[in-house]
């Protein structure tokens, strides 16, 4: 019967006794940077070409015996997971292997850098179809390795990496921390984070998504017909590399940004038990398990968005945090979050010709996060409209006044430390959905976009009594672009988007009196693109 991991990534409509997805990734080449491999294993023979690239350190220890099957173990298994003819994800994909890990699974930053350069040169000499590079390795944070990944990604290569097996923040490791790389954590058959001895999968904001990574059956280098179970974020990354190969084979023109958004969109949502993660990492870690799209074509009509969290600002009074979208993405909204609730809001600002989301810490605060909502919106023209503090009793307001521009997000930023502590909430006047409303002492920022066929609407959900969390979701066919809290609720910790749901978090209700101040309203801006929908119908 079908191995659990292949069943897990397969949409129900393809499920059968055997894993036979419609497109096997035949137009895509996957580069594997790992140990040596047993290329004559019948699972991968003819599918994997061993390049002459080898850059590995000497094995440690005088008593180390170099045994071929042990040297090949990790790479052979991963090659099988990606493209094995029996237990592989992308059965049609061809692979090339580069040896950057020695027989003990150790490598160097320099070896990996030279390997990436080898791939870049190969691509220049003989351009082929879409390329996926699988980096099933993790070391300490390396600015130079991250920069090399960035260069290759900007040359059109999709890089997929393991989050690391240190039960730690993936942002502390490379290449996992490189924003341009698709970073993958590991889950088990119960959709729980993988535990590996006393450690386990890495987590945090640098992880893009999770994938099966425990008890994964794959080719064993022990013998030509041998199979073995292995576990770890390397195996998880191999699944995503396989899924990426299949998506790219179906749609070879996909950009890295489009691919990442699709991987996120088609993932299983909210199935991971977040209690496994440290409390401070739960909100930052994506609750997503990778899956193949239900159809490899026809996803183009959707407006895809993802949430990008910044690094923590740190606790100093004037500390800020910045969240950035990928080059091909549009920043459609910006929000902020602080566990202490002490923050001075957020604003969208231009940096290097691109909008970024900046959050501001407040005096006595433990620090803030900026949260960017990054979307794929072709032919978009977005701008930020700002209204300075109004000092008027009705609060500050700003709207999208340009013809054809719609509101995609609202942000507010203030200079005073105790904004609104004793003020009742300001309610948005009805019938004015294209408007952001805020405290009179706050400057309000409206993200206004024009794009063919783009339409947006505001959805609110208010709870009169104090509640730790208030949510509002966009309905089917609409995508959440903006998430904010209605002003006046001083105990709000912040707002952020989780998939298609806007979450507004408040302080522990036990510390808040049940006054009008306890009212919490979550405001979602939901958008869709009729232009994209029509375009995909024409293609079909």
């Amino acid at each position: 019967s079908i191995p659990w991991n292949l069943e897990r990534i397969t949409p129900p409509r393809y499920r059968a006794d055997e894993y036979q997805p419609p497109d096997g990734g035949s137009l895509v080449e996957v580069y594997l940077l790992d140990t040596s491999i047993q290329s004559d294993h019948r699972e991968i023979e003819g599918r994997v070409m061993v390049t002459d690239f080898e850059n590995v350190p000497e094995e440690d220890g005088t008593r180390f015996h170099r045994q071929a099957s042990k040297c090949d173990s990790h790479g052979t298994h991963l090659a099988g997971v990606v493209s094995g003819r029996d237990a592989g994800v992308a059965k049609g994909a061809s692979m090339r292997s580069l040896r950057v890990l020695n027989c003990q699974g150790k490598g160097t930053v320099s070896g990996t850098l030279i390997g990436l350069e080898f791939i870049r040169k190969s691509q220049l000499v003989q351009p082929v179809g879409p390329l996926v590079v699988l980096l099933p390795l993790a070391g300490g944070y390396s600015r130079v390795l991250n920069a090399a990944c960035q260069r290759l990604a900007r040359a059109g290569v999709v890089l997929v990496t393991a989050a690391g097996n240190f039960r730690d923040d993936a942002c502390l490791y490379s290449p996992a921390s490189a924003p341009e790389v698709i970073t993958v954590g590991a889950t088990n058959a119960q959709d729980q984070p993988v535990t590996l001895g006393t450690l386990g999968t890495n987590f945090g904001r640098c992880v893009d998504l999770f994938a099966p990574g425990e008890d994964i059956i794959g080719a064993s280098s022990d013998c030509s017909t041998c199979f073995v179970s292995q576990s770890g974020t390397s195996q998880a990354a191999a699944h995503v590399a396989g899924i990426a190969a299949m998506m790219l084979s179906a749609e070879p023109e996909l950009t890295l940004a489009e691919l990442r958004q699709r991987l996120i969109h088609f993932s299983a949502k909210d199935v991971i038990n977040e209690a496994w993660f440290p409390e401070d990492q739960r909100v930052l870690t994506p609750n997503l398990v990778a899956a193949l799209p239900p159809s490899t074509h026809g996803a183009g009509w959707q407006l895809f968005c993802r949430t990008v969290w910044s690094a923590h600002s740190g606790p100093t009074r004037m500390a800020t945090a910045v969240a950035r979208c990928a080059p091909d993405e549009e920043l459609l909204s910006c929000s902020s979050f602080s566990r202490s609730g002490k923050r001075r809001g957020e604003r969208m600002e231009a940096q290097g010709g691109k909008l970024v989301c900046r959050a501001h810490n407040a005096f006595g605060g433990e620090g803030v996060y900026a949260i960017a909502r990054c979307c794929l919106l072709p032919q978009a023209n977005c701008s930020v409209h700002t209204a300075p503090p109004a000092e008027a009793s009705m609060g500050t307001r700003v709207h999208c006044h340009q013809q054809g521009h719609v509101l995609t997000g609202c942000s507010s930023h203030w200079e005073v430390e105790d904004l609104g502590t004793h003020k009742p909430p300001v309610l948005r006047p009805r019938g004015q959905p294209n408007q952001c409303v805020g405290h009179r002492e706050a400057s309000i920022h409206a993200s206004c976009c024009h794009a063919p066929g783009l339409e947006c609407k505001v959805k609110e959900h208010g709870i009169p009594a104090p509640q730790e969390q208030v949510t509002v979701a966009c309905e089917e066919g609409w995508t959440l672009t903006g998430c904010s809290a209605l002003p006046g609720t001083s105990h709000v910790l912040g707002a952020y988007a989780v998939d298609n749901t806007c979450v507004v978090r408040s302080r522990d209700v036990s510390t808040t009196g049940s006054t009008s101040e306890g009212a919490v309203t979550a405001v979602a801006i939901c958008c869709r693109s009729r232009h994209l929908a029509q375009a995909s119908q024409e293609l079909q």
Partner: antibody, heavy 119, light 113 residues
Framework: QVQLVQSGAEVKKPGESLKISCKGS????????ITWVRQMPGKGLEWMGL????????RYSPRFQGQVTISADKSISTAYLQWSSLKASDTAMYYC????????????WGQGTLVTVSS | DIVMTQSPDSLAVSLGERATINCRSS????????????LAWYQQKPGQPPKLLIY???TRESGVPDRFSGSGSGTDFTLTISSLQAEDVAVYYC?????????FGQGTKVEIK
């Protein structure tokens, strides 16, 4: 039920070509390997090679490499063993069998095809 | 190539008696990654194709009578018929299926004494 049905006995002259078949039914043909085994009169079993119909990957025993060709047509769930120029020493019973990646032994066998090469 | 050697070449046993066939491989077919012996036993009766009896050295195929058992590990293996029946008259082959080319033993002919 799961079965492999082989084509009938063949009598050929040396130098002639031949293609014998093995049709699978009752299972997912593309997800199993098909192995060919030779048994010369009064002798033991010799593994010739295999094919994976899913992608037509083949593997031959060095002894049979270049002597025979293994192929498959997954649209009709059939594997083939062929010779371009038969020799008298090719006289034997030929069996096809299936095996799976998780069970790499031959669990189901065809009934065999007797090939006689004689002038 | 892994060479499989069976002994004896032929064996005559009385009905109801135990028959023991040995098989030795030129290199180990036990693999540490899954702790399995990649060895199978087949029975071939006159005019019939081979039939799988035992796989992973000791696991009986469904439908095979429990008088057939396999044992051994690494390089030395044994097929035992605990109480020989008339229908057990056949040639028995061991096979390693771990390395290409896959190889069979030369066969052991079991007859009734």
């Amino acid at each position: 039920q799961v079965q492999l049905v082989q084509s009938g006995a063949e009598v050929k002259k040396p130098g002639e070509s031949l293609k014998i078949s093995c049709k699978g039914s009752g299972y997912s043909f593309t997800n199993y390997y098909i192995t060919w085994v030779r048994q010369m009169p009064g002798k033991g079993l010799e593994w010739m090679g295999l094919i994976y119909p899913g992608d037509s990957y083949t593997r031959y025993s060095p002894r049979f490499q270049g002597q025979v060709t293994i192929s498959a047509d997954k649209s009709i769930s059939t594997a083939y063993l062929q010779w371009s120029s038969l020799k008298a020493s090719d006289t034997a019973m030929y069996y096809c069998a299936r095996d799976h990646w998780s069970r790499p032994y031959s669990d189901v066998w065809g009934q065999g095809t007797l090939v006689t090469v004689s002038s | 190539d892994i060479v499989m050697t069976q002994s004896p070449d032929s064996l005559a046993v009385s009905l109801g008696e135990r028959a023991t066939i040995n098989c030795r491989s030129s290199q180990s077919v036990l693999y540490s990654s899954n702790n399995k012996n990649y060895l199978a036993w087949y029975q071939q009766k006159p005019g019939q194709p081979p039939k799988l009896l035992i796989y992973w050295a000791s696991t009986r195929e469904s439908g095979v009578p429990d008088r057939f058992s396999g044992s051994g590990s690494g390089t030395d293996f044994t097929l035992t018929i605990s109480s020989l029946q008339a229908e057990d008259v056949a040639v028995y082959y061991c096979q390693q299926y771990s390395s290409f080319p896959i190889t069979f033993g030369q066969g052991t002919k079991v007859e009734i004494k």
